[in-house]
Amino acid sequence: MKVLQEPTCVSDYMSISTCEWKMNGPTNCSTELRLLYQLVFLLSEAHTCIPENNGGAGCVCHLLMDDVVSADNYTLDLWAGQQLLWKGSFKPSEHVKPRAPGNLTVHTNVSDTLLLTWSNPYPPDNYLYNHLTYAVNIWSENDPADFRIYNVTYLEPSLRIAASTLKSGISYRARVRAWAQCYNTTWSEWSPSTKWHNSYREPFEQH
């Protein structure tokens, strides 16, 4: 049994880091493998993560963490029984993938303005809470070409757009994702999408 692709890990910078790797053949990850991880910190202990299958030869492990600070570094040991398959380290602050925003809501009752709001996925005491920016994706269910991205570079988790920038009488969907420039993070996953029917009063044309 050998590791084909070494574990790579990303942290949500809150409570979970996710490590993925590939073995050289089909593997029952949960029964054959264990990923031990230990914070490099005085008197810390090694903790065990039981991996799950992620495709035939792929494994994924969700490492529980109390909290994360920039100085944190973890040692990682991948074991198959008594055999050490791989040894490495992981610094969560250098591999951050934020949590996805939630509770995306489209408010359509504000005159001819669409107000999209969502929730910051972090509690106020987390460092990322005040450092997230967002991308909002809006697309038409009827027209695949009607697909747009709005970058929200301010901290408030909301976006206002004129309803008239979208076609009237058509159903649209929206989703939102987040990233943090301070840690040069990857983008989060997209939030679940939300759907609404776009309708607005056409301006009266005078001839």
Epitope: L39, L43, D67
Partner: antibody, heavy 125, light 112 residues
Framework: EVQLVESGGGLEQPGGSLRLSCAGS????????MTWVRQAPGKGLEWVSS????????YYADSVKGRFTISRDNSKNTLYLQMNSLRAEDTAVYYC??????????????????WGQGTTVTVSS | DIVMTQSPLSLPVTPGEPASISCRSS???????????LDWYLQKSGQSPQLLIY???NRASGVPDRFSGSGSGTDFTLKISRVEAEDVGFYYC?????????FGQGTKLEIK
């Protein structure tokens, strides 16, 4: 009641050996790191050694490294300090103390919050 | 090793008066979690040390509120707002950021 009780001290000749014990009660012993601190007659406090909750990590003062061994038996709620090659300068009262909570990913520190009554080690010919 | 320096080494105090002990470390005791790994202990004559303050400013369980700890980085202070006769003994600061844990020399508080 949370309590630590040391035993095993006594008079020993230079080069000799002693094994100190520290019995814990009133708390989940294996959840906590443990520490030995000593105090020579008329002197201040000196850290000797520490061990994590599982016993997997141990730390020693340079003055005792290679001569003393810290260990624990969590099934007996007992901490040990095996002292070999004893020297006159090891003469002291030895205290065990409860250290940080180590069952969490990041050990939680609340100070050395519980101390034993101390056991006296005298090294003399 | 981190060197801990206490002052004064002797502190005569009148009962009811305040008292203050300083402790300086040769390196910062502030970890990136925001905690300072600095404790204060009191050892009364013939007794084991007892924890007063942990993580620089947190009072241990059962410790009277006349004891308070402050400071960050390398400079720390233990204050007793109104000294009582039972407070006599040796006061030690200790860093627990890294091994070897190191103690200050101790401050002897006595009643005038």
């Amino acid at each position: 009641e949370v309590q630590l009780v040391e035993s095993g001290g006594g008079l020993e000749q230079p080069g000799g050996s002693l094994r100190l014990s520290c019995a814990g009660s009133g708390f989940t012993f294996s959840d906590y790191a443990m520490t030995w601190v000593r105090q020579a007659p008329g002197k201040g406090l000196e850290w000797v050694s520490s061990i994590s909750g599982s016993g997997g990590n141990t730390y020693y003062a340079d003055s005792v490294k290679g001569r003393f061994t810290i260990s624990r038996d969590n099934s007996k709620n007992t901490l040990y300090l095996q002292m070999n090659s004893l020297r006159a300068e090891d003469t002291a009262v030895y205290y065990c103390a409860r250290d940080r909570l180590t069952i969490t990913i990041r050990p939680r520190y609340y100070g050395l919050d519980v101390w034993g009554q101390g056991t006296t080690v005298t090294v003399s010919s | 090793d981190i060197v801990m320096t206490q002052s004064p080494l002797s502190l005569p105090v009148t009962p009811g008066e305040p008292a203050s002990i300083s402790c300086r470390s040769s390196q910062s005791l502030l970890y990136s979690t925001g905690y300072n790994y600095l404790d204060w202990y009191l050892q009364k004559s013939g007794q084991s040390p007892q924890l007063l303050i942990y993580l620089a400013s947190n009072r241990a369980s059962g410790v009277p509120d006349r004891f308070s700890g402050s400071g960050s980085g390398t400079d720390f202070t233990l204050k007793i707002s109104r000294v009582e006769a039972e407070d006599v003994g040796f006061y030690y600061c200790m860093q627990a950021l890294s091994t070897p844990y190191t103690f200050g020399q101790g401050t002897k508080l006595e009643i005038k």
